[in-house]
């Protein structure tokens, strides 16, 4: 809203004159412009003890314009206001003040925070995260086969990032250990290079894992009766519950 100022006239006239320069329609030597050419805004500038009329293409900083039928006039905003809609409503405050609902404040009210970019008081925004995703498949070194103990991960998204005074965001991923029924990798799941080395290593790992756990999870291909199967399933459920309790305490979280 800063003005591209019409040059104030140099050659003043003792009485009201029509021969004015710089946007004035009428002027006097004591008060400067008295009225302006069409579409220009009339503003009174205080110079020492007297007020001088000036004609501008728009109102200067700290003033607002009113287009009356007979004159376009600039009126002062409140002292702490740089741009205003009218006397009551500021739209941009002077440096060091924050705008809140049309008023200029030196600090923001309770529950609001200062945005130092817009110099406005804004609502505090807290972090919002989505629900957790389902747990990923149990994996080890990027594979879902050839092992017994692995890790599974779940993630969530940040839906709303917090403002300066808002609550921080929670972790966006969680990892926990998992135990699966060991299954051999099919040909497609093994890399060509060092396949033998990997097979030997896996066999060694499998032997170790089998010996360290009483839960062989049906590696043998023995035939079981329905009663045996039912009994086995019951035991496995009990073990799974115990494992889940244990896993809750070994969760690893990563903050985004």
């Amino acid at each position: 809203q800063n003005a591209s100022r019409g040059r104030r006239q140099r050659r003043m006239h003792p009485n009201v004159s029509q021969g004015c320069q710089g946007g004035c329609a009428t002027c006097s030597d004591y008060n400067g412009c008295l009225s302006c050419k069409p579409r220009l805004f009339f503003v009174l500038e205080r110079i020492g003890m007297k007020q001088i009329g000036v004609c501008l293409s728009s109102c200067p900083s700290g003033y607002y314009g009113t287009r009356y039928p007979d004159i376009n006039k600039c009126t002062k905003c409140k002292v702490d206001c740089d741009t205003c809609f009218n006397k009551n409503f500021c739209t941009k405050c002077k440096s060091g003040f924050y705008l809140h609902l049309g008023k200029c404040l030196d600090s923001c009210p309770e529950g609001l925070e200062a945005n130092n970019h817009t110099m406005e008081c804004v609502s505090i925004v807290h972090c919002e995260a989505s629900e957790w995703s389902p747990w990923s498949p149990c994996m080890k070194k990027g594979k879902t086969c050839g092992f017994k103990r692995g890790t599974e991960t779940r993630v969530r998204d940040i839906l709303q990032h917090p403002s300066a005074k808002g609550n921080l965001c929670p972790p966006t991923s969680e990892t926990r250990t998992c135990i699966v029924q060991r299954k051999k990798c099919s040909k497609g799941e093994r890399g060509k290079k060092g396949r033998e080395r990997k097979r030997k290593k896996l066999n060694k790992e499998e032997r170790k894992e089998t010996s360290s756990s009483s839960d062989s999870k049906g590696l043998e291909s023995s035939i079981e009766t329905p009663d045996q199967q039912e009994n086995k399933e019951r035991q496995q459920q009990q073990k799974r519950r115990a494992r889940d309790k244990q896993q809750k305490s070994v969760s690893v979280s990563t903050v985004h």
Epitope: Y64, R67, Y68, P69, F85, N86, N88, F89
Partner: antibody, heavy 116, light 107 residues
Framework: EVQLVESGGGVVQPGRSLRLSCAAS????????MAWVRQAPGKGLEWVAT????????YYRDSVKGRFTISRDNSKNTLYLQMNSLRAEDTAVYYC?????????WGQGTMVTVSS | DIQMTQSPSSLSASVGDRVTITCLAS??????LVWYQQKPGKAPKLLIY???RLQDGVPSRFSGSGFGTDFTLTISSLQPEDFATYYC?????????FGQGTKLEIK
């Protein structure tokens, strides 16, 4: 607290006169341009007249020019509307309002009925 | 004079609905637009000035937008107290003109 209280409304015959008053308090009356806005029964808002803060200039809608006169007394914080040669179409609730580009403060209104 | 055209002239909606009222100016008025709310038997109340600025005390479910000739008033989630008549007014030129009003009724 800002208050604008209108008075002087009533039932009047066509061609007769009425004078409305508006007493202001709770703000610096002499800093504000003041206006009268009316609303005919079941109709929308219609600006009638405005007087600038120091009383030196007045503006009217075409349909009331020459019949209505807006004035103010800043020493009494009071706005007036002198209505002459009233017509049936002037029937409305008349609101006084502080007019600074927008109408920031309003009175509760006074009803003027022009009927024979 | 600048003509202001509001649409729709009346609107039925339910509590919780999102409602939009539009106001069209006959010439460019920059952002010099004001919205008022009026309830039966009461004086109008200023809601929004400078097209998008909320007046102190007005709930944040009210918002205004637009520039030039096209303006909108939006109520994001209607509350029972929002059923009223809404008016736009141009403040670009001093002789003020209002839209004809939009009456918001309960469906």
């Amino acid at each position: 607290e800002v208050q604008l209280v209108e008075s002087g409304g009533g039932v009047v015959q066509p061609g007769r006169s009425l004078r409305l008053s508006c007493a202001a308090s709770g703000f610096t009356f002499s800093d504000y341009d003041m206006a009268w806005v009316r609303q005919a029964p079941g109709k929308g808002l219609e600006w009638v007249a405005t007087i600038i803060y120091d009383g030196s200039r007045t503006y009217y809608r075409d349909s009331v020019k020459g019949r209505f006169t807006i004035s103010r007394d800043n020493s009494k914080n009071t706005l007036y509307l002198q209505m002459n040669s009233l017509r049936a179409e002037d029937t409305a609730v008349y609101y006084c309002a502080a007019h600074d580009r927008s109408f920031d403060y309003w009175g509760q209104g006074t009803m003027v009925t022009v009927s024979s | 004079d600048i003509q202001m055209t509001q649409s729709p002239s009346s609107l039925s909606a339910s509590v919780g609905d999102r409602v939009t009222i539009t106001c069209l100016a006959s010439e460019d008025i920059s952002n010099d637009l004001v919205w008022y709310q009026q309830k039966p038997g009461k004086a109008p109340k200023l809601l929004i000035y400078a097209a998008s600025r909320l007046q102190d005390g007005v709930p944040s479910r009210f918002s205004g937008s637009g520039f030039g000739t096209d303006f909108t008033l939006t109520i994001s989630s209607l509350q029972p107290e929002d059923f009223a008549t809404y008016y736009c007014q141009q403040s670009y030129k001093y002789l003020p003109t209002f839209g004809q009003g939009t009456k918001l009724e309960i469906k």
